[in-house]
Amino acid sequence: TTELTEEKYEYKEGQTLEVKCDYALEKYANSRKAWQKMEGKMPKILAKTERPSENSHPVQVGRITLEDYPDHGLLQVRMTNLQVEDSGLYQCVIYQHPKESHVLFNPICLVVTKGSSGTPGSSENSTQNVYRTPSTTAKALGPRYTSPRTVTQAPPESTVVVSTPGSEINLTNVTDIIRVPVFN
């Protein structure tokens, strides 16, 4: 059973989002991968890898860097100098053509807020990595990670086909808040 949850990441402006998406090696190692933002009904491709993917050959599009590790079945996504307007729902996809992409788990809800002067989040080169241990409160002043709700519908079928070969999707509600380090 595969749980599909929308994962929420909260940041201050200027920080860096670093996430990873895993995929089935045998199936998708040589496929192009893309990072997309859901804007209304139409997903917007922000960056995509070259084809065929090469190990440690990063693709940079503005503030976004994608690095595919086809030997490991992982795509690394990095968004630097986050801005409030970056807030939204993002997904990694196996990019086939604009009208059919396979969504990789899990969708990411990014929330970027203004950093107040002097807080760790206000540093332009500051980086945040999600930490691991569930707790009931987030670090004061720091960015945080939550997973407060589940994905109840897939992106519009006209643009994205959600593919989960060999998996039964079980939607569950997870409400953990995760402590995170704040790097200046």
Epitope: E7, D22, H72, N106, V130, R132
Partner: antibody, heavy 122, light 107 residues
Framework: QVQLVQSGAEVTKPGASVKVSCKAS????????INWVRQATGQGLEWMGW????????GSVQKFRGRVTMTRNTSITTVYMELSSLRSDDTAVYYC???????????????WGQGTMVTVSS | DIQMTQSPSSLSASVGDRVTITCQAS??????LNWYQQKPGKAPKLLIY???TLETGVPSRFSGSGSGTDFTFTISSLQPEDIATYYC?????????FGGGTKVEIK
């Protein structure tokens, strides 16, 4: 209590396979990656690979590719690592370790199993 | 692969001494570095993640610093229970790699 409990020591012959289990408890099993790290006697730590217990996807370091298989059984919150075509230099303690939340590029191993000694000898 | 070079490989110090271990990466790894402690016959234990953030429950005498290629791990006042081998680990790029370890002993 968050913990990883591994299966017991194994003695096996060259060319054979070994399957080590790692049972997780005390946390949401499908939220965090499980990694495998090995350590030969008196040597340093060597990362072997990772598994996302939710998607079932996994990956391994080049030197183990084709010899290592990682699987999981979510109903019993257990991850397995099978290493085949064993050689004498595979003799080591094999650890499972919890990594970061599966969607995060955060590879710190905060919970470790007690280790499983695998001896490969003819 | 990124090579992680730890120095010294071993050291001996007195209780109360300040102990410093360095870890050098073969290329820039930002602050994607963790430090572990391993006591004989035991599994490693995470002490510091993200170059300098102390793991919950770890005594404040342990600290980490650095960014880029050069990192430092410090025990401000060595205690008898700190006898162990310490490892750094980078996670900037795959594969993840560890330093060779630094064995800390009491004089």
């Amino acid at each position: 209590q968050v913990q990883l409990v591994q299966s017991g020591a194994e003695v096996t012959k060259p060319g054979a396979s070994v399957k080590v289990s790692c049972k997780a408890s005390g946390y949401t099993f499908t939220r965090y990656d499980i990694n495998w790290v090995r350590q030969a006697t008196g040597q340093g730590l060597e990362w072997m690979g990772w598994m996302n217990p939710n998607s079932g996807n996994s990956g391994s370091v080049q030197k183990f590719r084709g010899r290592v298989t990682m699987t999981r059984n979510t109903s019993i919150t257990t991850v397995y690592m099978e290493l085949s075509s064993l050689r004498s230099d595979d003799t080591a303690v094999y650890y499972c370790a919890r990594g970061g939340i599966s969607s995060s590029w955060h590879w710190a191993f905060d919970i470790w199993g007690q280790g499983t000694m695998v001896t490969v000898s003819s | 692969d990124i090579q992680m070079t730890q120095s010294p490989s071993s050291l001996s110090a007195s209780v109360g001494d300040r102990v410093t271990i360095t870890c050098q990466a073969s290329q820039d790894i930002n602050n994607h570095l963790n430090w572990y402690q391993q006591k004989p016959g035991k599994a490693p234990k995470l002490l510091i993640y993200g170059a300098y953030t102390l793991e919950t429950g770890v005594p404040s005498r342990f600290s980490g610093s650095g960014s880029g290629t050069d990192f430092t791990f410090t025990i401000s006042s060595l205690q008898p229970e700190d006898i162990a081998t310490y490892y750094c680990q980078q996670y900037d790029k795959l594969p993840l790699t560890f330093g060779g370890g630094t064995k800390v002993e009491i004089k």
